[in-house]
Interface confidence: low
């Protein structure tokens, strides 16, 4: 695919921010603020946690999540997985794009100690019009939201 | 705001690197090298630690800091905060843009052991001409500078 | 250097993914998948682990590596170094561009515990035609490959 950036076109970009409603506990992806504060959409749309591509091309997609806790929730896996996933009409399951695994919360962390960790992902992927990208964190109980600056999700065409 | 990238214009970009003078101990932001080695400014300017925007638009801004220590300095908080902040003439206080909190230096780290950790931030924000972006690390005593490759700060228009 | 992005030109970009052959154990850089799955090259070429620049300019280069283990390999250094390095015909040795040091696997790691950590690097550098960028991890025995989503390497012109 040859992709050209026309000088008269707006370059698609978005930055979505974490909000109180981001963590649903439903097993679905994280949800995001799209308008208030630092959040914006330009040439991309949003639906149920997903950035929706309106113009095909190569995009640098990124996400950061702020993790934290006091010790660890009961039954927590030793691995926290933070990933960006693609949904496409051509395939029934989500496709992993960029993924990180971390162990911020192992036995070395004392049981009643406050701890913080952060996970950043970013990379270039090809996206067709109508395809969607979502963020998932397993276990999302460890995601710490505050004001939209610590957990976020964005993209721009390159 | 509709922002177009004209084909005949240089796209603003910058990459600033850590130097011996970066850590002031004054409570101010980190200072940066702007010319030597890998550092450069193109369509952005610099003032007292800040990248200064000359052309309004959406920018991907980023920073990495190398953290390290032997145990932890006395009186160090259990949380290290690394953030990118905006200064605007329209508002008296700095505005948080992108922030990470980490606990590289908790009780799990033995008291006299060398440890290293790294914090990366990146995201798209809208910046007006004349607005400034700075990097802060609290506690900056844990930032480890060497040759400009481990701690840095940059931006480019998207 | 004044660099313009022509509207009729394809903007150079690439995203290379980790594969079973990435870790050579030879002391050389990591090797990458360039075509299958999420991997692609557009206006950049590849040679023996290196992204090779065909068009001079400023590039945002990035890499993520997934680290992990059960305990630690014998003879492991206390510091894991993940870096992006430039090779240029004008200089005999590789030049450090962006580097991170982490201590995911110190003596504080509790016995026989599975652990995971991730390292992300990204920043803007100027690259001339013919120059190459490679990724190195010391100790590469801790890099965990799976499906190309956890360890990767990419770039795009800004």
């Amino acid at each position: 695919l040859i992709q050209e950036r026309r000088s008269h076109e707006v370059n698609p970009a978005a930055h979505l921010t974490g909000a109180n409603s981001s963590l649903t506990g439903s097993g679905g992806p994280l949800l995001w603020e799209t308008q208030l504060g630092l959040a914006f959409l330009r040439g991309l749309s949003y639906h149920d946690g997903a950035l929706v591509v309106t113009k095909a091309g190569y995009y640098y997609i990124y996400s950061k999540v702020q993790l934290g806790g006091v010790g660890c929730p009961l039954g927590l896996a030793s691995t926290i997985t933070h990933g960006l996933y693609k949904r496409t009409p051509r395939y029934p399951e989500e496709l992993e794009l960029l993924v990180s695994q971390q162990s911020p919360c192992g036995r070395a962390t004392s049981s009643s100690r406050v701890w913080w960790d952060s996970s950043f992902l970013g990379g270039v992927v090809h996206l067709e019009a109508g395809e969607e990208v979502v963020v998932r964190v397993l276990d999302e109980r460890l995601v710490r939201l505050r004001d939209g600056t610590r957990s976020y999700f964005g993209a721009f065409m390159v | 705001l509709i922002q177009e990238r004209r084909s005949h214009e240089v796209n603003p970009a910058a990459h600033l690197t850590g130097a011996n003078s970066s850590l002031t101990g004054s409570g101010g932001p980190l200072l940066w090298e702007t010319q030597l080695g890998l550092a450069f400014l193109r369509g952005l300017s610099y003032h007292d630690g800040a990248l200064v925007v000359t052309k309004a638009g959406y920018y991907y801004i980023y920073s990495k800091v190398q953290l390290g220590g032997v145990g932890c300095p006395l009186g160090l908080a259990s949380t290290i905060t690394h953030g990118l902040y905006k200064r605007t003439p329209r508002y008296p206080e700095e505005l948080e843009l992108l922030v990470s909190q980490q606990s590289p230096c908790g009780r799990a780290t033995s008291s006299s052991r060398v440890w290293w950790d790294s914090s990366f931030l990146g995201g798209v924000v809208h910046l007006e001409a004349g607005e400034e972006v700075v990097v802060r690390v609290l506690d900056e005593r844990l930032v480890r500078l060497r040759d400009g490759t481990r701690s840095y700060f940059g931006a480019f228009m998207v | 250097l004044i660099q313009e992005r022509r509207s009729h030109e394809v903007n150079p970009a690439a995203h290379l993914t980790g594969a079973n052959s990435s870790l050579t154990g030879s002391g050389g850089p990591l090797l990458w998948e360039t075509q299958l799955g999420l991997a692609f090259l557009r206006g950049l070429s590849y040679h023996d682990g290196a992204l090779v620049v065909t068009k001079a300019g400023y590039y945002y280069i990035y890499s993520k590596v997934q680290l992990g283990g059960v305990g630690c390999p014998l003879g492991l250094a206390s510091t894991i170094t993940h870096g992006l390095y430039k090779r240029t015909p004008r200089y005999p040795e590789e030049l450090e561009l962006l580097v991170s040091q982490q201590s995911p696997c110190g003596r504080a790691t509790s016995s026989s515990r599975v652990w995971w950590d991730s390292s992300f690097l990204g920043g803007v550098v100027h690259l001339e035609a013919g120059e190459e960028v490679v990724v190195r991890v010391l100790d590469e025995r801790l890099v965990r490959l799976r499906d190309g989503t956890r360890s990767y390497f990419g770039a795009f012109m800004v």
């Epitope: - | 008291s111 006299s112 060398v114 | 630690c72 003879g75 492991l76 206390s78 510091t79 504080a108 790691t109």
Partner: antibody, heavy 116, light 108 residues
């Protein structure tokens, strides 16, 4: 291959100091701790402390605090262990050992004899 | 202060299985390491991180750890295995190395 080569045997009088060297090769010297372990004749192994060549940080076993000093010269990839105020019970073979997470490579040992 | 306790001596006949134990209160949370030291030589690592065997160490050497006890097992001991064996671990802060008193293995 990884090699740790130590200096030769020493005979010292009580109250004197001794400085043993350990030259590393076959790996990046600054990436690994150097530990020092001693062994008196017919006795077990006794850990003395470690030194990180990258940062020059050290940590010593309590029994040697105030008497031992571990240093390095990164330009020649060499670690040093100096023990002061020697007494007869310090007569032992002194080993350097490379340590990241495991003491995996050892020097050949240096016999230090303390005798009046 | 933290201690690792080993039996002073263990004797087996050639071909038999030798087991050398190392006990310490912190071993449930700490790795155990084992060294072989032959007369007049530097120690050689035979087991690390409880049960891992470095390259070049014969398969008859194995290690395990359960609760406060780590065990070095030599299956089918040979005459050349006669040596002193030391366990080591780290203290509660993970800063200091602690050696056991050593076990003299006799294969006769």
């Amino acid at each position: 291959q990884v090699l740790l080569v130590q200096s030769g045997a020493e005979v010292k009088k009580p109250g004197a100091s001794v400085k043993v060297s350990c030259k590393a090769s076959g790996y990046t010297f600054t990436h690994f701790d150097i530990n020092w372990v001693r062994q008196a004749t017919g006795q077990g192994l006794e850990w003395m402390g470690w030194m990180n060549p990258d940062s020059d940080n050290t940590d010593y076993a309590q029994e040697f605090q105030g008497r031992v000093t571990m240093t390095r010269d990164t330009s020649i990839s060499t670690a040093y262990m100096e023990l002061s105020s020697l007494r007869s019970e310090d007569t032992a073979v002194y080993y350097c050992a490379r340590g990241g997470t495991t003491l995996d490579y050892w020097g050949q040992g240096t016999l230090v004899t303390v005798s009046s | 202060s933290y201690e690792l306790t080993q039996p002073p001596s263990v004797s087996v006949s050639p071909g038999q299985t030798a087991r050398i134990t190392c006990s310490g209160d912190a071993l449930p949370k700490k790795y155990a390491y084992w060294y072989q030291q032959k007369s007049g030589q530097a120690p050689v690592l035979v087991i690390y991180e409880d049960s891992k065997r470095p390259s070049g160490i014969p398969e008859r050497f194995s290690g395990s750890s359960s609760g406060t006890m780590a065990t070095l097992t030599i299956s089918g001991a040979q005459v050349e295995d006669e040596a002193d064996y030391y366990c080591y671990s780290t203290d509660s802060s993970d800063n200091h190395v602690i050696f056991g008193g050593g076990t003299k293995l006799t294969v006769l």
